[in-house]
């Protein structure tokens, strides 16, 4: 046979293909321990066994076999805190972003068999164990039920639940998406005695209705109570029930602070402080005032009391309260004082220690960077993440503050661990932070490691993506740069993805990928092999992502610049960046495009219609086209109300439809799923109508029965193939 010809390794590398992306060939793994104690955790192995690990004894064994999992087609599990039972979750059926229904089976680990008798109804909307023992709370048909033991008959806590009307223990659409970001609205007290829950009354909320075509002769109509900007909102009430004898007093309502209850308001979160102390957070409908209320159980009254002197007010004078959401408190061991992230006098979000009043808060961190999340507060340490290190807003490092020391000393736990590979971390802590896992998302290959909570010493690599590393050896990956550009007094961070054989002396087509929503961040030091990676690798397109005004973690001046005027600076800053990129000399001015999804679709549409002539073409996937069409909680947070005496004028001026004429000189591809529960198809329908009325030619694609994510495999393949063809045509790239 002919001898093999030696080729230098450099030439054997191939470019990424679209197929690689659509097949998820280069997806990475992370490892999050499912902590069950200070030093023990569970993890689902590659072959679906549930494995128990003890860090200190190095013991590991299968606690639940894959055959047991498979016997009920389980895809998830949950161990009861007394370790006697496991719930197995199957028949997962997605509803909205976080919510889903499922069938649950309870497996008795002592007997090695499923619990028979009083089986759980199906499908269940939410189910969870109590934090102690093996009580179960679950939501079925919008009502909450309690089981004292898995084999016991259930006790029905609420009776008011009604489909699309009243939700107990689970959020309605708008609270799920825009406020709680969870599928649940119930919380056990630490000792499992009390169960707090929210009742959402949607009876007066207008309904969004859209067709779901399915396979039938007639389409189905999906009806969702969905408050758009200015519409009637859900009425919320918080109750707490004593789960030991829930039938005695029944649910006890927690009072709403007076200053909140005087007008429309939101419930924003609940945090148990101790077994008889709870912290509720409320927000005015005009979302610049937040109240944190600490309530105590009065045994003599059998009621929850929320004294006025335990109300803490957080107010923003330059925008909305909080970041994307109002931050939640991290309470100290004393169950009175707490740590919380909010804006300091310079407008940067930092950790503050509140002992009695917010006015007397002690600032714990400071600087022209932001504290992002408090992971854990222990007796002597506070762990948090920030973007302080080396001044890169798109990095995340984990820090420890020794709060026992005076003054508190700060240590960066992650900054120097794997500096080149890892600049963006999250963490997962065991119960009292005796151990923790670090998960690094990039910019290099993600890696998950286990650490000692006292010394921060690395104990073990949990997942290092070796297989992925090996398969990427043969791939010509693009080069990624994160840099900043200045314009006037403004600084914009950008990420540029450059083709593998990039040559500054040549001219390349440029694609701007934009999101740009308030308090979002696109320029992050994370690893990704996705569609834009492919476009750079195979098609030789330069990709740029720019964080303009309104984006997060660079101070309130930058963040609140867009307050009450969405659609202005976000677009302006993308245009500024494009001009700066052109000045760099390697961009072909005749071949510049922009694309975005959701808020990014809104910004890309407005950028294309800016009349600057900068863009040859662009794509908007599932764009918002008017803030009046979007959810009240979101739209009003940033825009106020669409009323004459508030901000109606800018609501009207900031629509995509108002700029229909300006699309005449660009190639525009408009894409939307017809079953989008989030950004309704209505948004694109109105853009299309306006373009037709203006006699402007454009291209469009709808995805029947697809939601905001256009997630089905077939649809995704079609979508990215379609967008690729459109871009290649726009850039005159041969197929």
């Amino acid at each position: 046979r002919p001898s093999r010809v030696y080729k230098p390794e450099g030439n054997t590398k191939r470019a990424l293909t679209l197929k690689d992306i659509l097949n998820g060939t280069f997806s990475y793994k992370t490892y999050f321990p499912n902590w069950i104690s200070e030093q023990e955790y569970l993890h689902q192995s590659e072959d679906d066994n549930i494995v128990f690990y003890n860090i200190e004894t190095r013991e590991s064994y299968i606690i639940l076999s894959n055959s047991t999992m498979k016997s009920v087609n389980a895809t998830d599990y949950g161990l009861s805190p007394d370790r006697q039972f496991v719930y197995l979750e199957s028949d997962y059926s997605k509803l909205w972003r976080y919510s889903y229904t499922a069938t649950y089976y309870i497996y008795d680990l002592q007997n090695g068999e499923f619990v028979r008798g009083y089986e759980l109804p199906r499908p269940i909307q939410y189910l969870c164990w109590s934090p102690v023992g093996s009580k179960l709370a679950y939501v079925y048909q919008n009502n909450i039920y309690l089981k004292q033991r898995p084999g016991d008959p259930p006790f029905q806590i609420t009776y008011t639940g009604r489909e699309n009307r009243i939700f107990n223990g689970i959020p309605d659409w708008v609270y799920e998406e825009e406020m709680l970001a969870t599928k649940y609205a119930l919380w056990w007290s630490p000792d499992g005695k009390f169960l707090a829950y929210v009742e959402f009354n949607d009876s007066d909320i207008p309904i969004i209705a859209y067709s779901y075509y399915g396979d039938g002769q007639y389409p189905r109509t999906i009806n969702i109570p969905y408050p758009k900007a200015g519409a009637k909102n859900p009425v919320v009430r918080v109750f707490i029930v004593d789960t030991t004898y829930p039938h005695h007093v029944g649910p006890m309502e927690v009072p709403v602070p007076e200053m909140i209850a005087s007008s429309d308001y939101y419930f924003s979160w609940l945090t148990w402080v101790s077994s008889e102390r709870v912290c509720l957070q409320w927000l005015k409908r005009v979302q610049n005032v937040s109240v944190l209320s600490i309530c105590d159980f009065r045994e003599d009254w059998h009621a929850w009391e929320c004294p006025k002197n335990q109300e803490h007010v957080e107010e923003s004078r330059t925008g909305w309260a909080g970041g994307f959401f109002v931050s939640t408190p991290a309470f100290s061991q004393d169950a009175t004082s707490y740590y919380k992230i909010f804006s300091d006098k310079d407008g940067y979000k930092h950790i503050h220690y509140i002992k009695d009043t917010v006015e007397n808060a002690i600032q714990i961190t400071s600087g022209k960077w932001e504290a992002i999340y408090i992971f854990r507060v222990t007796q002597d340490s506070l762990f948090y993440s920030s973007n302080e290190f080396e001044g890169y807003p798109g990095r995340r490092n984990i820090y420890r503050i020794s709060i026992g020391n005076s003054p508190p000393s700060k240590k960066c736990v992650t900054c120097h661990l794997r500096k080149e590979r890892c600049q963006y971390y999250t963490a997962s802590f065991s119960y009292k932070a005796k151990y923790y896992a670090l998960v690094c998302y990039g910019p290099g290959l993600p890696i998950s490691t286990l650490h000692d909570g006292r010394t921060d010493q690395e104990i073990q690599v949990l997942e290092e993506n070796k297989e992925l590393e090996n398969s990427l050896r043969n791939i010509q990956l693009p080069k990624v740069e994160i840099k900043k550009l200045k314009d006037g007094g403004l600084t914009f961070w950008y990420k540029m993805i450059l083709p593998p054989q990039f040559d500054r002396s040549k001219k390349y087509p440029l694609l701007i990928q934009v999101y740009g929503g308030p308090c979002s961040q696109s320029v992050k030091s994370v690893f990704a092999v996705n569609w834009i990676t492919y476009l750079a690798s195979k098609e030789g397109i330069v990709i740029a992502l720019v964080d303009g005004r309104g984006t997060a973690f660079q101070g309130d001046k930058f963040l609140h610049a867009v307050y009450r005027k969405l659609g202005v600076y976000e677009v302006e800053d993308q245009l500024t960046a494009v001009r700066k990129f052109i000045e760099m000399g390697f961009i072909d001015e005749e071949r510049i495009a922009i694309w975005g999804w959701s808020y990014g679709g809104y910004v890309s549409s407005l950028a294309l219609a800016s009349g600057t002539g900068l863009f040859k073409c662009g794509i908007a996937v599932a764009p918002v086209s008017s803030w009046e069409y979007y959810a009240s909680i979101y739209s009003e947070r940033f825009m106020g109300l669409p009323t004459k005496d508030d901000n109606l004028e800018h609501y009207k001026n900031s629509t995509v439809m108002a700029r229909a004429e300006y699309f005449r000189n660009v190639d525009y591809l408009l894409i939307h799923g017809t079953a989008d529960d989030n950004v309704h198809f209505q948004n694109s329908a109105q853009i299309a109508k306006a373009l037709v009325n203006a006699q402007v030619d454009f291209q469009a694609m709808w995805y029947s029965d697809q939601n905001h994510g256009i997630l089905s495999g077939r649809s995704q393949n079609h979508l990215y193939t379609h967008m690729t063809h459109f871009l290649k045509q726009c850039f005159s790239l041969s197929d």
């Epitope: 006790f155 009776y159 030991t244 039938h247 007093v249 029944g250 649910p251 309502e253 009621a303």
Partner: antibody, heavy 117, light 108 residues
Framework: EVQLLESGGGLVQPGGSLRLSCAAS????????MSWVRQAPGKGLEWVSA????????YYADSVKGRFTISRDNSKNTLYLQMNSLRAEDTAVYYC??????????WGQGTLVTVSS | EIVLTQSPGTLSLSPGERATLSCRAS???????LAWYQQKPGQAPRLLII???TRATGIPDRFSGSGSGTDFTLTISRLEPEDFAVYYC?????????FGQGTKVEIK
């Protein structure tokens, strides 16, 4: 000391109406779910109705549903039972009890309702 | 609804004797929701036992409760003269809450 004092009972003709009251003292009335339980002469106990702490949720036995209405006035520490379309089988001593669906830890002395022509 | 059947209907015993009262449910009741009451002639009922086995405030320790599922028992270890009365079991698991028909403990 916890006290529950019922009033408003008496003789009424079938089809008639009565309003029972229960004055509460010695505990935080507004924080307690309350019930009415009745006992026909020489018979056992029968739960009639319950009301949540703030009066938003009310529950009734099938035998009285649509005819009886439970309510409360937390400012007056008083529980009520409006009884309409009374029948002979509604004849009983009516107790007001502290509790929602069980663990009725305090009871009034009862008020007798007699439905007879 | 859950039907509670008490037995015996009447129990004739002497002071100092042990009384065992039974309560059977038509369907399983979680222990948390099973209570026992005592009623003397011309008086309102009095709460004795909650959660199937926990004595209510001020109840002497000669009263004890046990059982689970569908079978529950109230035991009076040594009958005192004041214990002769009618005893009712009650479930609060399911609406409507229901009472047993009662067991009369009388002096033999």
């Amino acid at each position: 000391e916890v006290q529950l004092l019922e009033s408003g009972g008496g003789l009424v003709q079938p089809g008639g109406s009565l309003r029972l009251s229960c004055a509460a003292s010695g505990f935080t009335f507004s924080s307690s779910a309350m019930s009415w339980v009745r006992q026909a002469p020489g018979k056992g106990l029968e739960w009639v109705s319950a009301i949540s702490t703030n009066g938003n949720y009310t529950y009734y036995a099938d035998s009285v549903k649509g005819r009886f209405t439970i309510s409360r006035d937390n400012s007056k520490n008083t529980l009520y039972l409006q009884m309409n379309s009374l029948r002979a089988e509604d004849t009983a001593v009516y107790y007001c009890a502290k509790g929602w669906l069980g663990n009725f830890d305090y009871w009034g002395q009862g008020t007798l309702v007699t439905v007879s022509s | 609804e859950i039907v509670l059947t008490q037995s015996p209907g009447t129990l004739s015993l002497s002071p100092g004797e042990r009384a065992t009262l039974s309560c059977r449910a038509s369907q399983s009741v979680s222990r948390s929701y099973l209570a026992w009451y005592q009623q003397k002639p011309g008086q309102a009922p009095r709460l004795l036992i909650i959660g199937a086995s926990t004595r209510a405030t001020g109840i002497p320790d000669r009263f004890s409760g046990s059982g689970s599922g569908t079978d529950f028992t109230l035991t009076i270890s040594r009958l005192e003269p004041e214990d002769f009365a009618v005893y009712y079991c009650q479930q609060g698991q399911v609406i409507p809450p229901t009472f047993g028909q009662g067991t009369k403990v009388e002096i033999k």
